[in-house]
Amino acid sequence: MAVTACQGLGFVVSLIGIAGIIAATCMDQWSTQDLYNNPVTAVFNYQGLWRSCVRESSGFTECRGYFTLLGLPAMLQAVRALMIVGIVLGAIGLLVSIFALKCIRIGSMEDSAKANMTLTSGIMFIVSGLCAIAGVSVFANMLVTNFWMSTANMYTGMGGMVQTVQTRYTFGAALFVGWVAGGLTLIGGVMMCIACRGLAPEETNYKAVSYHASGHSVAYKPGGFKASTGFGSNTKNKKIYDGGARTEDEVQSYPSKHDYV
């Protein structure tokens, strides 16, 4: 039950995380104009991975796509790549994890196969989450670097009379969405890996032994009471079994809890 819950929760958390990674990747507000110097600007700039936008106080918003591939900064290309890899891995992970879910029966799939699939999807979610976190962090670092560079030469003018105010950019909403989503995907992946351990059939180091009562000296009585016909020194040679204890054979002869849907 706990394994099913862990697996299910891991799947849901990862699903939310991947949806968040997709949302963050598509969002236009990766960087937004810093309003520290002009909090009441009539023109507000913000940028995403795919296009940059300008919102006028008139209410009109104009967005322009980055129609060049070679002209874009290498860091931006790297962030795009990381986010796309994260989405692709996450999507594959989701697909694999659907079939790995304990509550879904597909043909006569073995528990070991489900365990392997759960582990695979878990690893995929972890890598997906790490890609998203890395992508967002690289972009954030790029912003911080550019912010301080533009602050250093914020005002360039002729004789101090005419000022050209350089637009500075700060963290946009997409960065926070990306960090949270990446974290959720990572957590979901870890939960799937934990669930995998519970799904895998336990392998033991000892051989299965079947015990049979030889003669009248051993009696099997359920309920944990020890019973014997003899008293004295010979008792130490007799095999006395707790009714609650089972041999390896007995365990396997019962329907496994993993056989129930």
């Epitope: 600007t41 023109v43 209410g59 105010v165």
Partner: antibody
Framework: EVKLVESGGGLVRPGGSLKVSCAAS????????ISWVRQTPEKRLEWVAT????????YYLDSVKGRFTISRDDAKNTLYLQMSSLRSEDTAMYYC???????????WGQGTSVTVSS | NIMMTQSPSSLTVTAGEKVTMSCKSS????????????LTWYQQKPGQPPKLLIY???TRESGVPDRFTGSGSGTDFTLTISSVQAEDLAVYYC?????????FGAGTKLEIK
Amino acid sequence: EVKLVESGGGLVRPGGSLKVSCAASGITFSRYAISWVRQTPEKRLEWVATISSGDSYTYYLDSVKGRFTISRDDAKNTLYLQMSSLRSEDTAMYYCGRLGYGNAMDYWGQGTSVTVSS
Amino acid sequence: NIMMTQSPSSLTVTAGEKVTMSCKSSQSLLNSGNQKNYLTWYQQKPGQPPKLLIYWASTRESGVPDRFTGSGSGTDFTLTISSVQAEDLAVYYCQNDYSYPLTFGAGTKLEIK
């Protein structure tokens, strides 16, 4: 046809209050930001206030901040400018205008005259 | 606040002449996000409210005759009337639409001989 009609202007004593209105027709009023601009007797144009569409965010000229309040009633297609603690320097012709591309006022009303005098 | 300076304050021309008037801002009106200059030109004829002529420094408003041309970038802007007509008698104002407060220039009064 887009039409903006201002009303409510008049003569008021210094320190007094006045509420001017701007009724819009021919436009989806709620979709646009609207501004108030005044023209002094010396013919200088001075932007007074702007109210955005949707969130109704407001912007004011520093000299009117705290004294003037811009508001809108999208259901009535009407813009308001509540003026209080009026001064002689507030004497002007008050125009309302719709903001279009580039934050430019593409449509103007005919204006309403406000005179602050004792 | 961005200061807008217009020159000349007035000019008198004959019909058919080419006219240029200048507008300078104390700060750049060029927005890096879309490479557009947030400068607007208005025309105000006697007894009328101002009328939009040009926005984004060079984009002509629909219905405005093509003899009106806006140019310039950053801090220096120009309005040119290629062949002045009698109906162009008016005061021309430039406005900063980039940063609040949205300041206007003092205007250039165009008179016809």
